[in-house]
Amino acid sequence: LKGQEFAPSHQQVYAPLRADGDKPRAHLTVVRQTPTQHFKNQFPALHWEHELGLAFTKNRMNYTNKFLLIPESGDYFIYSQVTFRGMTSECSEIRQAGRPNKPDSITVVITKVTDSYPEPTQLLMGTKSVCEVGSNWFQPIYLGAMFSLQEGDKLMVNVSDISLVDYTKEDKTFFGAFLL
Amino acid sequence: LKGQEFAPSHQQVYAPLRADGDKPRAHLTVVRQTPTQHFKNQFPALHWEHELGLAFTKNRMNYTNKFLLIPESGDYFIYSQVTFRGMTSECSEIRQAGRPNKPDSITVVITKVTDSYPEPTQLLMGTKSVCEVGSNWFQPIYLGAMFSLQEGDKLMVNVSDISLVDYTKEDKTFFGAFLL
Amino acid sequence: LKGQEFAPSHQQVYAPLRADGDKPRAHLTVVRQTPTQHFKNQFPALHWEHELGLAFTKNRMNYTNKFLLIPESGDYFIYSQVTFRGMTSECSEIRQAGRPNKPDSITVVITKVTDSYPEPTQLLMGTKSVCEVGSNWFQPIYLGAMFSLQEGDKLMVNVSDISLVDYTKEDKTFFGAFLL
């Protein structure tokens, strides 16, 4: 429709246009986590604030039970940052003991769940070895990319160790998505 | 307006549509910083290139005095990367001296200032301990997320230590925002 | 066109509107790399999966021979993550040998090639020293920003060392762009 005038013609059907302001969007922020039991080899999912402070959901993008629900098919930009913190790493203790260095690691995964599909799909992964020498460490992992999602898809953020997630400030750990 | 033809009806008022090309947008790039006095417990703000090289502002998004000025209310994607570099870290010096390991850290904050509100709002924070063993280190912190902003809001990027910011290349340290 | 009704007037030419769904977009994912000869002081380019799994190109955004081809002028958001992994670092070996600490580094560059311009333009760079103490390390570098591109521009992702790139999973290393 580039540069085309809208002439009064009943015959002409235009490509689907829509106001940008009514697109599904969400920005979720960290809350204090309640550690829960999870299956071995399956990372626990974070839960989120969806309406207080900087957090919001709008235009039928809903948050429920750790999931962002996709209300409409299309291409979405999805992002998350998780800030991890710890007080020394096993790696440095192992190093001091002179044993082989198996590094600790921190991992964030943005996962898509489609009810009609048995297995979740990992959309994005950020993973980092942590072999700090100092006794206290903290660092963020940021992820963001575009994906084609279907109405009814659900998105969640999983982490390798929920007890290392910094939940103290809403600007440090967050999760969002918007329809392009 | 999905799939709807534009029939010649004066009665029908459509949702606000707008050309994507006329939305406020900016990509700012690093310049050499002039260290300035700042308040205790308040990180200094970076200033930016806004028209040379890769940098631009358009559609009423203006840059002035370290701030990006938001010309129109709406949901914006805001991002920044700051590359830091340093010579060894206090942490490793402390370690060598056998004293307790207090880590150095590097921090980036994207801050919103609203004239009608007394306190700035921290939108995004990336913070990382730096406890490098090597004598020279460098690393980026990247941030990006979506926020609902109001006309007149101002955005800036604050860093924990302006003297550690790598200002040598426009692709290493940058700041941008665009209306969705 | 905010809040304006589309009255049947042949005189009125509207700003270029276009359906969001027909904008050029691509998300490319990592594949196993074939190390190729590259010029000294020039980082090798990664090649990508463009149609299997999470990868796609659409609306005239094409991928060919390591390049994303820009089919239409405009402002694009461009992003990439590269996950690197290695076995110990030269830095720690140098340290053990008591020689000066020249850190290893890992670097990602998103580069624009314009046929009419002799030199590629570096749009984004993420560079990090790697001076790990543990014997195995892995970490991502993420980049993303908005740029004004011209029809015919080509985008690629270059890395400092192709042999350190983790090509094992499509969610760890990826490259994308979309017209805003």
Partner: antibody, heavy 118, light 107 residues
């Protein structure tokens, strides 16, 4: 309801040993970090040790490092503190406490008194 | 180690009073600051975590503020059950350290 019950305190001579236990119920013990905090009579609170949910990380205050050992048995929902080479200054009420991410101590036991005296 | 200095060490106040207790860290601790209440013969109870977040079940008359090195616990209207000792604690780095405590007594 979250419950933490400490046991194993008592009177011990200087140089002696004691093993404190903390029995947890009402929450998923294996997912929480656990801590020992002590309080000498009439004094303030002193953190002495922490253990990660999976025992990957152990932390100690300098005042007890090398003498005390923290451990846990997730199958038994139990936390332990093995105290060796006890000194008079270790006399205190010992509390076990949960934490979620090394931020705060959100649940506490009622404490057990350890008295080191000859 | 990070030293935590609380003031005052004790104070006398009446029911209904607004009470403020301050805590200062020897170095910046961001918002890694918690407040606890302890009554005689009882275990401490978490009131405020991360400088300003109210622990579930704690009355809203308790509030916390501050970041960096200076922090405040405020009781907006003192109630009879609030007479107790109050401790601040930093969780920025190990060793985790507490302030010396503030005893709030009935005037």
């Amino acid at each position: 309801e979250v419950q933490l019950v400490e046991s194993g305190g008592g009177l011990v001579k200087p140089g002696g040993s004691l093993r404190l236990s903390c029995a947890a119920s009402g929450f998923t013990f294996s997912t929480y970090n656990m801590n020992w905090v002590r309080q000498a009579p009439g004094k303030g609170l002193e953190w002495i040790s922490s253990i990660h949910s999976s025992s990957n990380y152990l932390y100690y205050a300098d005042s007890v490092k090398g003498r005390f050992t923290i451990s846990r048995d997730n199958a038994k929902n139990s936390l332990y503190l093995q105290m060796n080479s006890l000194r008079a200054e270790d006399t205190a009420v010992y509390y076990c406490a949960t934490d979620r991410a090394m931020v705060d101590f959100d649940y506490w036991g009622q404490g057990t008194l350890v008295t080191v005296s000859s | 180690d990070i030293q935590m200095t609380q003031s005052p060490s004790s104070l006398s106040a009446s029911v209904g009073d607004r009470v403020t207790i301050t805590c200062r860290a020897s170095q910046s601790i961001s918002t890694y600051l918690n407040w606890y209440q302890q009554k005689p013969g009882k275990a401490p109870k978490l009131l405020i975590y991360a400088a300003s977040s109210l622990q579930s079940g704690v009355p809203s008359r308790f509030s916390g503020s501050g970041s960096g090195t200076d922090f405040t616990l405020t009781i907006s209207s003192l109630q009879p059950e609030d007479f107790a000792a109050y401790y601040c604690q930093q969780s920025y780095s190990t060793p985790l350290t507490f302030g010396g405590g503030t005893r709030v007594e009935i005037k």
